[in-house]
Interface confidence: medium
């Protein structure tokens, strides 16, 4: 904790300027008025404060705004943002995309994924939904940050905005997030022709159900293996060997490379070995000939 001392008269601060870098921590604490600091936050970034001096300045702002900083201060935090914890950021109400841009720029190159995720969350809450301008800002200044949002927040994305999302923005999205985004993408791209539709929907397919994957297998899409590997396990398991062959087209040979990895491994275990042999890839692990497959889940559901 910073010691409380009285400010020597010759050290009194009337302006936030470079002379402050020579103040010891206790002098900064005693001599810098928190309200003056808040009013002149835009100057802080132009002064080479040490890491420890920044701690003191943060402490002063925390005391002045225990319920969370106002946006007028947040917008000008600059590198002081690197001192904020997710708990600090959770108290904020941010609506301006200029504020978001400024802080995303500052966080670049620093290990701040938790803080950035919380900041984006506050922006979505502040603006009421994940609108096109917000998505555009995220894709421009923080590729991949879209996936830091919870499925609940992503559910506020209108389908009309989905077109602004690029494949690389979805690279870090998990299954639950893609579950939310996929139906929106399907709606957004529904009027497109087969090949154009597949190009657009491909990054979202990690959220597709079995029936949609089956439908794609009838459209000669030649799905690449990387996309196939990102499909939900539950969506892949019910597919027949013929459907997977149609779905992958010339890429079907890649199954051999991924033989030991989910969902390919799990899918192989569900297929008859005879059927797998028709692919001519030497895939092993299917159900041997003459075995009867009982689907116990059906019996359990009936009992």
């Amino acid at each position: 904790d910073v010691e409380r001392t009285t400010c020597p008269p010759e050290k009194e601060v009337h302006e936030i300027d470079e002379s402050l870098i020579f103040y010891k921590k206790r002098e900064l604490e005693a001599c810098v008025d928190a309200a003056l600091l808040a009013a002149q936050m835009d100057r802080v970034d132009a002064i080479p404060f040490t890491y420890e001096q920044l701690d003191v300045l943060k402490h002063k702002l925390d005391e002045l705004y225990p319920q969370g900083y106002p946006e007028s201060v947040i917008r000008h935090l600059g590198h002081l943002f690197l001192k904020m914890s997710p708990e600090d950021i959770r108290k904020w109400n941010v609506t301006s995309l200029e504020t978001l841009k400024a802080l995303l720029k500052v966080s670049k190159g620093h290990e701040m994924s938790a803080q950035v995720a919380t900041l984006i969350d506050r922006v979505v809450v502040g603006r009421g939904q994940l609108d096109k301008d917000t998505v555009d800002t995220l894709t421009a200044f923080c590729p991949g940050c879209l996936c830091s949002l919870s499925p609940e927040r992503l559910s506020s994305v209108p389908p009309s905005v989905i077109g602004a999302v690029r494949p690389q923005d979805l690279d870090t999205c998990g299954p639950r997030q893609l579950d939310v985004l996929y139906p929106k993408a399907r709606l957004a791209f529904q009027n497109m022709s087969g090949s154009e539709y597949f190009v657009k929907i491909r990054p979202f397919l990690g959220g597709a159900p079995t029936e949609d994957v089956k439908a794609l297998s009838q459209q000669n899409v030649s799905m690449d293996l990387a996309t196939f590997m990102k499909l939900r396990r539950e969506a892949v398991l019910p597919l027949t060997v013929a459907e997977v062959q149609k779905l992958l087209g010339p890429h079907v040979e890649g199954l051999k490379v991924e033989e030991q990895h989910s969902p390919v491994r799990d899918w192989i275990l569900k297929q008859r070995q005879d059927d797998l042999d028709t692919l001519g890839l030497g895939l092993q692990g299917g159900i041997p000939n003459g075995y009867l497959i009982l689907d116990l889940s059906v019996r359990e559901a009936l009992s």
Partner: antibody, heavy 120, light 107 residues
Framework: EFQLQQSGPELVKPGASVKISCKAS????????MNWVKLSNGKSLEWIGV????????SYNQKFKGKATLTVDQSSSTAYMQLNSLTSEDSAVYYC?????????????WGQGTTLTVSS | DIVMTQSQKFMSTTVGDRVSITCKAS??????VAWYQQKPGQSPKLLIY???NRYTGVPDRFTGSGSGTDFILTISNMQSEDLADYFC?????????FGAGTKLELK
């Protein structure tokens, strides 16, 4: 890869001035503060001052105020240090060193050094 | 100004040794201390920051410890390429100050 390329050795007469340059490459010049450090024979390293390229604002060690002037040219990603009223005491190796002021606060990359010799 | 004292100007060592270089600050600097290595004709290289964090690419035989006023740089298994000058530096407050350096030499 990061590089701080300093200008070559200087031999100057007492009373003259000299301007040393430090060209940054391989990183965003405005994201790091630029420090200058003096290494003289028989003495340790001495911090001269720091400049924030983004704003052009600088701060100096009291000992070097009036002796050193720090400037930057953002367009060429180059930092400069001018030393004036030179005496033999200023003969030393001068380094520029970048400092991500807000992330560890240490001088994580240094230029190769510029040797200054002040002699009549 | 904060004075950083490296009491040993020279230290004799042999390959494989465990070497500890000490540095004392004239007042509390928390963990705002860095260690640098400088070989003849080269510029200083950052080894340790925030008293104990190893900088990217620095071999794990180098470790830093300490807080407040007393700091140690330890080389656990001395190698011939480690023969150099070692400087500590505080960045708790301005002006930034350095220790006078400790030179490692072969016995």
């Amino acid at each position: 890869e990061f590089q701080l390329q300093q200008s070559g050795p200087e031999l100057v007469k007492p009373g003259a001035s000299v301007k040393i340059s430090c060209k940054a490459s391989g990183y965003s010049f405005t994201d790091y503060n630029m420090n200058w450090v003096k290494l003289s024979n028989g003495k340790s390293l001495e911090w001269i001052g720091v400049i924030i390229p983004n704003y052009g604002t600088s701060s100096y060690n009291q000992k070097f105020k009036g002796k050193a002037t720090l400037t930057v040219d953002q367009s060429s990603s180059t930092a400069y240090m001018q030393l004036n009223s030179l005496t033999s005491e200023d003969s030393a190796v001068y380094y520029c060193a970048r400092w991500d002021n807000y992330y560890g606060s240490s001088l994580d990359y240094w230029g190769q050094g510029t040797t200054l010799t002040v002699s009549s | 100004d904060i004075v950083m004292t490296q009491s040993q100007k020279f230290m004799s060592t042999t390959v494989g040794d465990r070497v500890s270089i000490t540095c004392k600050a004239s007042q509390n600097v928390g963990t705002a201390v860095a260690w640098y290595q400088q070989k003849p004709g080269q510029s200083p290289k950052l080894l340790i920051y925030s008293a104990s964090n190893r900088y990217t690419g620095v071999p794990d035989r180098f470790t830093g410890s300490g807080s407040g006023t007393d700091f140690i740089l330890t080389i656990s298994n001395m190698q011939s390429e480690d023969l150099a000058d070692y400087f500590c530096q505080q960045y708790s407050s301005y002006p930034l100050t350095f220790g006078a350096g400790t030179k490692l030499e072969l016995k």
